[in-house]
Interface confidence: low
């Protein structure tokens, strides 16, 4: 006769491992007992269980509730056992020794491989700012056995680099994604993809990119000079910019305080019915945590009673300050 077994048994952490050991012999042969042992190069042999044809299953207390026979129906020639809830520490070599009558004893060894699915963690890099050079956007780490594969899925242009650290029973893989930040990347997904033989499907963790920037400021509202006449109602100046984080707006008048009745509402400066007192240089200040920018305009309110006067508007230089 001979033993039917497997060279390698592979299970995922927490699954039950079936350690196969089936004696295929002549019809009149019987299996008296099957002994199972763990064979460790450092600790030597450690008995797990004895499966006796008459007295049943006897389990080493260290493996109580963990070693069982497969569910019925069972063939009397089948010495296979189930190692319940396989853990990483179970990985290694196992031996079954089969005592038969009348053919004698047989033994076989097999290796149990326990796959430890990785638990990925994604760590964003330092805050991204437009104008930086190649910068770490995020790193993704996954530890498992065997070593997991860590890659990136994104439409964003960048470079990825990986390194791994080997531990006694597992390996940790860290992949970094570097990019040159630009505002177009804002809101773009950066997904870490972890593959592993112990996973039914890839694990994915998505990080949404945020790139700090502040656009140049400009002022709208003076396009039609003829609208800026004494008595006109509803005149407004609107400051235009965009940024991440969203910028805050403020209005001042360069040549004195804002005239009475002029109201600031966010990015918009609202005027009461216009008078010549409203003529002057107005400055829009735009700022966020990254930087600040200014844009100034000169407003001259035309008095229809004074036909020699023309509305003059000048968009002056834009100023930009980094924080």
């Amino acid at each position: 006769g001979e033993l039917e077994t497997s060279d390698v048994v592979t299970v995922v952490l927490g699954q039950d491992a079936k350690l196969p050991c089936f004696y295929r012999g002549d019809p009149d042969e019987q299996v008296g007992q099957v002994a199972w042992a763990r064979v460790d190069p450092n600790e030597g042999i450690r008995e797990l269980a004895l499966l006796h044809s008459k007295y049943g299953l006897h389990v080493n207390p260290a493996y109580e509730d963990r070693v069982e026979q497969p569910p019925p129906p069972r063939d009397p020639l089948d010495g296979s056992v189930l190692l319940r809830n396989a853990v990483q520490a179970d990985e290694g070599e196992y031996e079954c020794r089969v005592s038969t009558f009348p053919a004698g004893s047989f033994q076989a060894r097999m290796r149990l491989r326990v796959l430890v699915p990785p638990l990925p963690s994604l760590n964003p890099g330092p805050p991204l700012e437009e104008g930086q050079g190649l910068t770490l956007a995020a790193s993704c780490t996954a530890e498992g056995s065997p070593a997991p594969s860590v890659t990136w899925d994104t439409e964003v242009k960048g470079t990825q680099s990986s390194r791994s650290f080997t531990h006694p029973r597992s390996a940790a893989v860290t992949s970094e994604f570097h990019l040159v930040p630009s505002r177009s990347m804002n809101g773009q997904p950066l997904t870490c993809v972890v593959s592993h033989p112990g996973l039914l499907q890839d694990r994915r963790i998505t990080h949404t990119l945020q790139v700090a920037f502040l656009a140049e400021a400009s002022v709208r509202g003076l396009e039609d000079q003829n609208l800026w006449q004494v008595g006109r109602e509803g005149a407004t100046l609107k400051c235009l910019s965009e940024g991440q984080p969203p910028p805050k707006y403020n209005w001042t008048r360069l040549d004195g305080p804002l005239p009475s009745g002029v109201r600031v509402k966010g990015d918009t400066l609202g005027f009461p019915p216009l008078t010549t007192e409203h003529s002057g240089v107005y400055v829009c200040h735009v700022s966020n945590e990254l930087s600040s920018r200014d844009s100034q305009v000169t407003v001259e309110v035309l008095d229809p009673e004074d036909p020699g006067k023309q509305v003059d508007l000048v968009s002056a230089s834009h100023h930009h300050h980094h924080h």
Epitope: L13, G14, N85, V87, Q88, A89, V116, L119, P120, S121, E143, H167, P168, A172, L200, R203, I205
Partner: antibody, heavy 121, light 107 residues
Framework: QVQLVQSGAEVKKPGASVKVSCKAS????????MHWVRQAPGQGLEWMGW????????NYAQKFQGRVTMTRDTSISTAYMELSRLRSDDTAVYYC??????????????WGQGTLVTVSS | DIQMTQSPSSLSASVGDRVTITCRAS??????LNWYQQKPGKAPKLLIY???SLQSGVPSRFSGSGSGTDFTLTISSLQPEDFATYYC?????????FGQGTKVEIK
Amino acid sequence: QVQLVQSGAEVKKPGASVKVSCKASGYTFTGYYMHWVRQAPGQGLEWMGWINPNSGGTNYAQKFQGRVTMTRDTSISTAYMELSRLRSDDTAVYYCARGSALHFFGVFDYWGQGTLVTVSS
Amino acid sequence: DIQMTQSPSSLSASVGDRVTITCRASQSISSYLNWYQQKPGKAPKLLIYAASSLQSGVPSRFSGSGSGTDFTLTISSLQPEDFATYYCQQSYSTPLTFGQGTKVEIK
């Protein structure tokens, strides 16, 4: 039997640091991850991070990065959690919890009795 | 981060009742869901791991089910020692997160 015994209650002033210990017995200390979980008075549970006692490798919750340090001394089977720059909202019971062998990364099969840390000026 | 939401936040029941607590994850966590029991002044205790596996030593009246985003803890016949607060927790990815808890009180 598996036991995790933590150090006693602490009262600290804002801005100070606290170091809580967790002594393990009844199992192979280096064979299981150790996690730290806290619970503010009357509130739910909040995971802070883990340490792999075998390698010393750590993984901290983003919320605590820069303020928490987890270490271990394998010679005395003890894990430590140090939290710095304490604030009043750090007042909580701090637990150490063993990561199970089945799921070392996220299932806590044994817990310490907890250490009350009170932050008050 | 994955958010875990439990319902109800509290419930009143009598000894012998069948009690069901639900937990919802903000994204699919497969079966990486665990349940804990906590009594006042005590540390939490693991009841169920991997959504439905009963932790050794835990009475069989406790059972768990579900996968993906929706999970359930069931106590088939409530015993006096079961009055406590129950927490779900995901172990799909870090940071590991808990539900806000469900307090089971005596009616």
